[in-house]
Amino acid sequence: QPSVSPGEPSPPSIHPAKSELIVRVGNEIRLLCIDPGFVKWTFEILDETNENKQNEWITEKAEATNTGKYTCTNKHGLSSSIYVFVRDPAKLFLVDRSLYGKEDNDTLVRCPLTDPEVTSYSLKGCQGKPLPKDLRFVPDPKAGITIKSVKRAYHRLCLHCSADQEGKSVLSDKFILKVRPAFKAVPVVSVSKASYLLREGEEFTVTCTIKDVSSSVYSTWKRENSQTKLQEKYNSWHHGDFNYERQATLTISSARVNDSGVFMCYANNTFGSANVTTTLEVVDKGFINIFPMINTTVFVNDGENVDLIVEYEAFPKPEHQQWIYMNRTFTDKWEDYPKSENESNIRYVSELHLTRLKGTEGGTYTFLVSNSDVNASIAFNVYVNTKPEILTYDRLVNGMLQCVAAGFPEPTIDWYFCPGTEQRCSASVLPVDVQTLNASGPPFGKLVVQSSIDSSAFKHNGTVECKAYNDVGKTSAYFNFAFKGNNKEQIHPHTLFTPRSHHHHHH
């Protein structure tokens, strides 16, 4: 009981002046609170409280449930308490069967005793099962038994409070421990697709999957840089204890261009937060964008191979693709495939394989592609480089020597004179006239060049060489002259093909 010091308020006095009182069931509980400023008695046991404004608390026939703490409070807010045990052989424990534990925290099994003089007050597993080896507890007859540092593994543990009364073990009603897991990691979030491309009016639907130890994980879909509440639908599952999954589905039934943007699925728990985003692009209509992977003007040597390659973006997916040359469609020699197997892929590749190209196969090769909304095409101009070919060389009636050569790129014709029997023609002769004959003709064929010189310039026996050359190779033709008196006579002209890096004669 409190000691009174004059001049300052003191706590009330209780009669009987004890901290604990044991009363037999059926007997009277009579408690007197002595204080000039008495306010109330309060009774507390388990989760219940009762009040009494009379300064004398009387319970005529005490029951086990009257066991508890009786507190008297005065007008200064000071109080004194006495704990009363109502001993009932038929009811050793008062029980509040609600038993929750938070992982890693202590929790109280509320089974206070009605008789403080029993022994071996402890916890026991149900149906004789042992308690987990690492379960530690601390008994308190007035409150119950505290389980220390609750583990997740104790979830759904069935147990009893137990005590020995007159040499006999007595069990309380059963308790089921429900453990609330501690969040020890952020939620795991994933999204059905990282990006979406839609046409106006199409439905946008995306699902976020949130996984955590408890359904108390918070999740929401948010639009980046927007506070607007989005409409979500949920599905959830418990895959066993501490394994919860939620699917949050965001739907825009008729997407508009201004719905385009980044959508974030955000989840958090008491440990932290996680998020994942998806990008929506809404276009007013479909599109095709073609990107050549090589220059659209292609030079290739006669007899060599070339691959015409395009990449293209198509949305919706491409329906028809074709390669065309001279109004003819290729049925083979080409392939078309998606750039990736990703379901969001809109990029494709098309390749036309041209093999052992001839000089006559230059021209415009066109790739055409279409989908349900648009058509698109791209043209490649293919030039086949060919060595010059001397088509004609003649002595004209007007005394001119003429040499006509065809090839690509445009050949250059040079003239040389070889006096007597010399093999090497080094003295160059300037032409009188040079014309490109088909400059206005087909744009991709061989180019034809005609060059003429005046034969009257030659005064001695010898050979005139017409040499046609370009980047690919060179070809020569020869005019042999012999003078008979004053007359000049042409003797069997012949040609010599000289490849770019070789020199040999054909007679």
Epitope: D47, E48, T49, N50, S98, Y100, K102, N105, R156, K174, I176, K178, R180, S214, S215, S216, V217, Y218, S236, H238, D241, Y244, N269, T270
Partner: antibody, heavy 118, light 107 residues
Framework: QVQLVQSGAEVKKPGSSVKVSCKAS????????ISWVRQAPGQGLEWMGT????????RYAQKFQGRVTITADESTSTAYMELSSLRSEDTAVYYC???????????WGQGTLVTVSS | DIQMTQSPSSLSASVGDRVTITCRAS??????LAWYQQKPGKAPKLLIY???SLQSGVPSRFSGSGSGTDFTLTISSLQPEDFATYYC?????????FGQGTKVEIK
Amino acid sequence: QVQLVQSGAEVKKPGSSVKVSCKASGGTFSSYAISWVRQAPGQGLEWMGTIGPFEGQPRYAQKFQGRVTITADESTSTAYMELSSLRSEDTAVYYCARGGYISDFDVWGQGTLVTVSS
Amino acid sequence: DIQMTQSPSSLSASVGDRVTITCRASQSISNYLAWYQQKPGKAPKLLIYDASSLQSGVPSRFSGSGSGTDFTLTISSLQPEDFATYYCQQYYYESITFGQGTKVEIK
């Protein structure tokens, strides 16, 4: 004995929100879970969500996720349930009850009638 | 979520009759099942918890049995005050579901 006392009846317009309170007396508020259950006229019981025990986020029924918010104020031993974007089918009696974290409901409030009407 | 199916949805009985109501869970819920009684205009009242434990203050004529997916509420001798609607409820996980109810009427 623990008692749960709920706020009075409400009449609300479609699209608005309602917030119902549930005050616990005669017991320790923090050691329990508090749940909300609703019952439409002539219909069965429907669990909406649970808060507690201990701190942490509430758990909601997937049907109400995103539309219901359950909170608790330990200092006043009061739990609250707010339901937004009300529609006529939300007309029901809303009950608070003690329990619900893997447990039954042993104590119930008297119920609050919420009528949604234009 | 776990679905609870109650049967019958209604029944007529006389005072003194033995009445049985069944409840089936869509997956095993061990014994995490409660039974409630509700009278018109009143809040539900807990009768049975953990499938077979009688709530304090509830008359012993009420009993519950079952485990896993199939459960039964039995009223051994129906009394006038027992005419009401009865609901089963599972609480195996954090998400709770009720049966649709069984209305017990006077024959």
